[in-house]
């Protein structure tokens, strides 16, 4: 029988603490045993649970991808917090990867928001002040601007 084949309670490390569920639930940092009788602690740095639960195993800790920095490590009650490296951002609609921020705004637009780990630079039309959304323009259309210098 391989380690993988064994049920969770047979794989539990000797040092994993056990306690009794409260109204069928185990506290954050724990999961419930298959028979529902015990709460078993998550393994620090490997898995976690954030809420009272009746999960049969804790949740696997996220590993930060290349291109990401680890803001805070995984604990038994909180997942790893990863953030895009400087100059890149993660959009809500494509959370699986960090994308490069645009280096500047299209002609006729001015930068009003910087690149952050969660948003691209923000561009608005000079005259109307309306936001520009969409893909980065072709390189020859791009006008770069440094802070304090309006785009020409």
């Amino acid at each position: 029988i391989t380690q993988q084949d064994l049920a969770p309670q047979q794989r539990a490390a000797p040092q994993q603490k056990r306690s009794s569920p409260s109204e069928g639930l185990c506290p954050p940092g724990h999961h419930i045993s298959e028979d529902g009788r015990d709460c078993i602690s998550c393994k620090y740095g490997q898995d976690y649970s954030t809420h009272w639960n009746d999960l049969l195993f804790c949740l696997r800790c996220t590993r930060c991808d290349s291109g990401e920095v680890e803001l805070s490590p995984c604990t038994t009650t909180r997942n790893t917090v990863c953030q895009c490296e400087e100059g890149t951002f993660r959009e809500e609609d494509s959370p699986e990867m960090c994308r490069k921020c645009r280096t500047g705004c299209p002609r006729g637009m001015v930068k009003v928001g910087d690149c952050t780990p969660w948003s691209d630079i923000e561009c608005v039309h000079k005259e109307s002040g309306t936001k520009h959304s969409g893909e980065a323009p072709a390189v020859e259309e791009t006008v770069t601007s440094s802070p304090g210098t309006p785009a020409s």
Epitope: I1, Q4, D5, A7, Q9, D54, L55, L56
Partner: antibody
Framework: QSVEESGGRLVTPGTPLTLTCTVS????????MSWVRQAPGKGLEWIGI?????TTYYASWAKGRFTISKTSTTVDLKVTSPTTEDTATYFC??????????????WGPGTLVTVSS | ALVMTQTPSSVSAAVGGTVTINCQAS??????LAWFQQKPGQPPKLLIY???KLASGVPSRFSGSGSGTEFTLTISDLECDDAATYYC????????????FGGGTEVVVK
């Protein structure tokens, strides 16, 4: 390693029926086992599971209608009071634990139960 | 009770093509989703467990993705042998949550 269901037959409504899943090549003390059924021409329907320690859990719709139990080499599914809607092929499946997930990786060929008056 | 909604119910594609099947859970099931292939007269065969991990012997043309409540099975470089019905299932992960199956998707290979 294998699992095989038996006990499927034609029964009249209300007549209790027990299906047996016989396993070989592995120990039931190390694996959870599920029962799943499939009505003719229909999809798969999960009935319940018995854990490696013998604790049973049932689908919401199946509670009271089925009872799962086990010995060292068999897992039984008792259909307490069959109706015509229980006509189906019944499968048992071994649940493998992958560290952060279970999955039914080893299935029997199924046994057909027909409930008719 | 947990409900798994699978779409489409049937899909047709040519040999060499790509098929995408969606599965939606009525509540958060984290990454506890499995995909099965079933051919007439046979028991289901496990393809993918824990959302995206390939079961032993399953070709890499099969891939799974998603988390929480939205999941996808993709079959690329479709072969004639892929003609079957595919089911998603919320795998056992909680003592109070049903291991419900989706309604199935019939894949027809042209």
């Amino acid at each position: 390693q294998s699992v095989e269901e038996s006990g499927g037959r034609l029964v009249t409504p209300g007549t209790p029926l027990t299906l047996t899943c016989t396993v070989s090549g592995f120990s039931l003390s190390n694996y959870a086992m599920s029962w799943v059924r499939q009505a003719p021409g229909k999809g798969l329907e999960w009935i319940g599971i018995i854990s490696s320690s013998g604790t049973t859990y049932y689908a919401s719709w199946a509670k009271g209608r089925f009872t799962i139990s086990k010995t060292s080499t068999t897992v039984d599914l008792k259909v307490t009071s069959p109706t015509t809607e229980d006509t189906a092929t019944y499968f048992c499946a071994r649940e493998t634990y992958y560290g952060y997930s279970y999955a039914a990786g080893l299935w029997g060929p199924g046994t057909l139960v027909t409930v008719s008056s | 009770a947990l409900v798994m909604t699978q779409t489409p119910s049937s899909v047709s594609a040519a040999v060499g093509g790509t098929v995408t099947i969606n599965c939606q859970a009525s509540q958060n099931i984290y990454s506890n989703l499995a995909w099965f292939q079933q051919k007439p007269g046979q028991p289901p065969k496990l393809l993918i467990y824990e959302t995206s991990k390939l079961a032993s012997g399953v070709p890499s043309r099969f891939s799974g993705s998603g988390s929480g409540t939205e999941f996808t099975l993709t079959i690329s470089d479709l072969e004639c042998d892929d003609a079957a019905t595919y089911y998603c299932q919320s795998s056992w992960h909680s003592i109070s949550t049903d291991c419900a199956f989706g309604g199935g998707t019939e894949v027809v290979v042209k």
